[in-house]
Interface confidence: low
């Protein structure tokens, strides 16, 4: 069965950092790209940015830039997000979610990781 | 940044009433090469990831009944719900792919 | 990884065609775009065109349009560029590349930059 | 079609010196869209850098790009042997065009 499991919720303090893991299994991860969106509470879902699976190349919004890392190990299925530098209004529900080129919709998202930022 | 714009931010229908949502882009997301808009809309209810209802413009993913459909082309699209159900109650996206991803702002459906 | 394999080089006459082609392995074929760039010697590097194989349809730098044909055998993984009307200013190395630009509307993943390379091909135009 | 204009030709430098690079776009480019490359003599060409300043995998944190609008940099903050090749840079604009290249040689 196709799926992406995220990792849980985290609590941090401004300024801190968090890693999100997201774990594919049931279809092989090289053929697909992984992007990470995020939800704040009562806001619109926001693009953050993607990782190619295969090559690990990857692209974030600008906004973002420079304050997220997203990385891969294939051997364990996994992609990751990581954000810095965190602030309050980073406190937000990030999904995972597949892609595959020549497509380019979500047909498969994790559940969704509550990040809260409080001091 | 293609910057997506969805109308009404909420709708209020009755059970078995049709219900419709709009979407612009601001610019077009018709790929003349391949003949595909890439614009998707996914249904998302509280609590829940998003879930894809339509991609390319209108084509139903697989499982989701026949009473949503997706229309439009260029800049301009539409989803239409022709006989809301009560388990239609949700939030729906828009979301374009034609560069990056940029997400519409929701319009919530509730039930009149 | 993705590893690009070309044909061999190439002598031909003025006003022949060429047709190079570009095997690939170690990923999965219809999942990339596959762009055509060329070299001629002591030059610079020169896009010629590129193709989405999934969806079949090429398309061509200005400078080389009527001249190039791009396609791609899925069932192979394999990417062809056939140059026609040969002469001797073709003479160059020719090089596929992963990625292809974005006015595809590939959603952000071709942004113009190419990466693995194959080999090259030289193909030499000479009477 | 946008000219991108690759400056010095040449750069004479010693190992473990810094090498700046640039890069002049005949107009605006977005930053999304800008590439460099190394070549090696008799081997194609390598991606270092994608979307002006991230780095390809693989490629050692000496190399770095920067910049905007219609001026772009490569750095290399301590040259080792190995760095020592021709250095492109390259745009996505309607089509694709390369500058001229950098000849980065042993002083």
């Known amino acids: 069965q196709v799926q992406l499991v995220q990792s849980g919720a985290e609590v941090k303090k401004p300024g801190a950092s968090v890693k999100v893991s997201c774990k594919a299994s049931g279809f092989n991860i090289k053929d697909y790209y992984m992007h990470w969106v995020r939800q704040a509470p009562g806001q619109r879902l926001e693009w953050i940015g993607w990782i190619d699976l295969e090559n690990a190349n990857t692209v974030y919004d600008a906004k973002f830039q420079g304050r997220v890392t997203i990385t891969r190990d294939t051997s364990a299925s996994t992609a990751y997000m990581e954000l810095s530098s965190l602030r309050s209004e980073d406190t937000a529900v990030y999904y995972c979610a597949r892609d595959a080129y020549g497509r380019y919709f979500y047909d498969v998202w994790g559940q969704g990781t509550l990040v809260t930022v409080s001091s | 940044d293609i910057v997506m714009s969805q109308s009404p931010d909420s709708l209020a229908v009755s059970l078995g009433e049709r219900a419709t949502i709009n979407c612009k882009s601001s610019q077009s997301l018709l790929n003349a090469r391949t003949g595909k808009n890439y614009l998707a809309w996914y249904q998302q209810k509280p609590g829940q990831p998003p879930k894809l209802l339509i991609y390319w413009a209108s084509t139903r993913s697989s499982g989701v009944p026949d009473r949503f459909s997706g229309s439009g082309s260029g800049t301009d699209f539409t989803l239409t719900i022709s006989s809301l159900q009560a388990e239609d109650v949700a939030v729906y996206y828009c979301v374009q792919s034609y560069f990056r991803r940029t997400f519409g702002g929701g319009t919530k459906v509730e039930i009149k | 990884q993705v590893q690009l394999v070309q044909s061999g080089a190439e002598v031909k006459k003025p006003g022949s065609s060429v047709k190079v082609s570009c095997k690939a392995s170690?990923?999965?074929?219809?999942?990339?775009?596959i762009s055509w760039v060329r070299q001629a010697p002591g030059q610079g590097l020169e896009w010629m065109g590129g193709i989405i194989p999934i969806f079949g349809t090429a398309n061509y730098a200005q400078k080389f349009q009527g001249r190039v044909t791009i396609t791609a055998d899925e069932s192979t993984s394999t990417a062809y560029m056939e140059l026609s009307s040969l002469r001797s200013e073709d003479t160059a190395v020719y090089y596929c590349a992963r990625g292809a630009p974005n006015y595809y509307g590939s959603g952000g993943y071709d942004d113009g930059w190419f990466d693995p390379w194959g080999q090259g091909t030289l193909v030499t135009v000479s009477s | 079609e946008i000219v991108l204009t690759q400056s010095p030709g040449t750069l004479s430098l010693s190992p473990g010196e810094r090498a700046t690079l640039s890069c002049r776009a005949s107009q605006s480019v977005s930053s999304s869209y800008l590439a460099w490359y190394q070549q090696k003599p008799g081997q194609a060409p390598r991606l270092l850098i994608y979307?002006?300043?991230s780095r390809a995998t693989g490629i050692p944190d000496r190399f770095s790009g920067s910049g905007s609008g219609t001026d772009f940099t490569l750095t290399i903050s301590r040259l080792e042997p190995e760095d020592f090749a021709v250095y492109y840079c390259q745009q996505f604009g309607r089509d694709p065009t390369f500058g001229g290249g950098t000849k980065v040689e042993i002083k």
């Open positions: 979307g002006a300043s």
């Open positions: 170690g990923g999965t074929f219809s999942s990339y775009a």
